[in-house]
């Protein structure tokens, strides 16, 4: 806390300038009004303040606003948003999407900090849900933006925010996300031909069911492996062997090289070897010929 | 991103000069502040002189004045601080910053 005195003769500030980076902390305290800087905050962020001296400007601005400030400051506090603490955040309504553009811009090329996290949420919370806009200006700030959210808070994202969604978005996404925003996909891509439709909804299959992977199969799709081994495996589980070989098309001479991981190696072991032996492959593991496969939990279910 | 390499520090003599250089990338200067600062062990950062990158007003510390000058070449977007008449008291790490960005800083140390 700085001490409260007065303001030397002659320093009183008449504008936020570079002159005010030479004034020791009291200075800063005693000199410069609130606010004329709640007024100049977009020249802080050109002068280099340092870590001491932005403390007290942040302590000007708490006290001007004691119940948090207005956005028309917060959409130009630059790095002085650095120090703020979520718990300052929480304060805010931030409605304008310029402001929140303005506050990651400070915040790009390092890690969702605590505070960046908070004013997200503020601002998805303050507009409903999370609009297209929205979500191409978070994942462009950072990718991992949707994989971060919960499914609940997912299923408020609408099918037309999935346009503004790209592959790179999905890669730390798990099945329980997947299996949210694919129908979300499939309802925003449902207009377009097959060979389009695919390439939009590759990214979101490890969310598909069964028949939505069979439905593909007859599609001449040539899904690639990498793609394969993020289904679901309750999903794979069920496909032939004829189905698999037209969904994978070329690539399925890749099941080789993955035999021994989910979901090929649990696929394989509901196989019959026979049919597997088509495939010209090498796949072992299947079912011997002769072996009547009974699927118990149909029959749990039936008694 | 900015990027801000100061360079040119070393161990000088009471009374003799220096020249520390601060190049920067990443970005063009127009709308920044540069300044150079300093920071003696145990002591706050202090602002040392800056200049300003568009109007080019030039500003020094008390404690340097008619001893230090700052300037600055456009074309190879480099900060210059040349620091006569050293004294043991200046002894410090010197950091050149630019709006919002530092640098790592120099070490120059004046003694006999």
């Known amino acids: 806390e700085v001490e409260k005195t007065a303001c030397p003769s002659g320093k009183k500030a008449r504008e936020i300038d570079e002159s005010l980076i030479f004034y020791k902390k009291w200075e800063l305290e005693a000199c410069v009004d609130a606010a004329l800087l709640a007024t100049q905050m977009d020249r802080v962020n050109a002068i280099p303040f340092t870590y001491e001296q932005l403390d007290v400007l942040k302590h000007k601005l708490d006290e001007l606003y004691p119940q948090g400030y207005p956005e028309s400051v917060i959409q130009h506090l630059g790095y002085l948003f650095l120090k703020m603490s979520p718990e300052d955040i929480r304060k805010w309504n931030v409605t304008s999407l310029e402001t929140l553009k303005a506050l990651l811009e400070v915040n790009k090329g390092h890690e969702m900090s605590p505070q960046v996290a908070t004013l997200i949420d503020r601002f998805v919370k303050g507009r409903g849900q999370l609009d297209k806009d929205t979500l191409d200006t978070l994942t462009a700030f950072y990718p991992g933006y949707l994989c971060s959210l919960s499914p609940e808070e997912l299923s408020s994202v609408p099918p037309s925010s999935i346009w503004a969604v790209r592959p790179q978005d999905l890669d730390t996404c798990d099945p329980r996300q997947l299996d949210v925003l694919y129908p979300k996909a499939r309802l925003a891509f449902q207009n377009m031909n097959g060979s389009e439709y695919f390439v939009k909804i590759q990214s979101f299959l490890g969310g598909a069911p069964t028949e939505d992977l069979k439905a593909l199969s007859q599609q001449n799709v040539s899904m690639d492996l990498a793609t394969f081994m993020k289904l679901r495996t309750d999903a794979v589980l069920p496909l032939t062997v004829a189905e698999v070989q037209k969904l994978l098309g070329p690539h399925v001479e890749g099941l080789k090289a993955e035999e021994r991981h989910r979901p090929v190696r649990d696929w394989i072991l509901r196989q019959r070897q026979d049919d597997l032996d088509t495939l010209g492959l090498g796949l072992q593991g299947g079912i011997p010929n002769g072996y009547l496969v009974l699927d118990l939990s149909m029959q749990e279910a039936l008694s | 991103q900015v990027q801000l390499v100061e360079s040119g520090g070393g161990l000088v003599q009471p009374g003799g000069s220096l020249r520390l250089s601060c190049v920067v990338s990443?970005?063009?200067?127009?709308?920044?502040?540069m300044a150079w600062f300093r920071q003696a062990p145990g002591k706050e950062r202090e602002a040392v002189a800056s200049i300003n990158w568009s109007s080019g007003r030039l500003i020094y510390a008390d404690f340097v004045k008619g001893r230090f000058t700052i300037s600055r070449d456009n074309s190879k977007n480099t900060l210059y601080l040349q620091m006569n008449s050293l004294r043991p008291e200046d002894t410090a790490v010197y950091y050149c910053?630019?709006?919002?960005?530092w640098g790592q800083g120099t070490q120059v140390t004046v003694s006999s």
């Open positions: 910053a630019a709006g919002r960005y």
């Open positions: 990443g970005r063009t200067l127009e709308s920044y502040v």
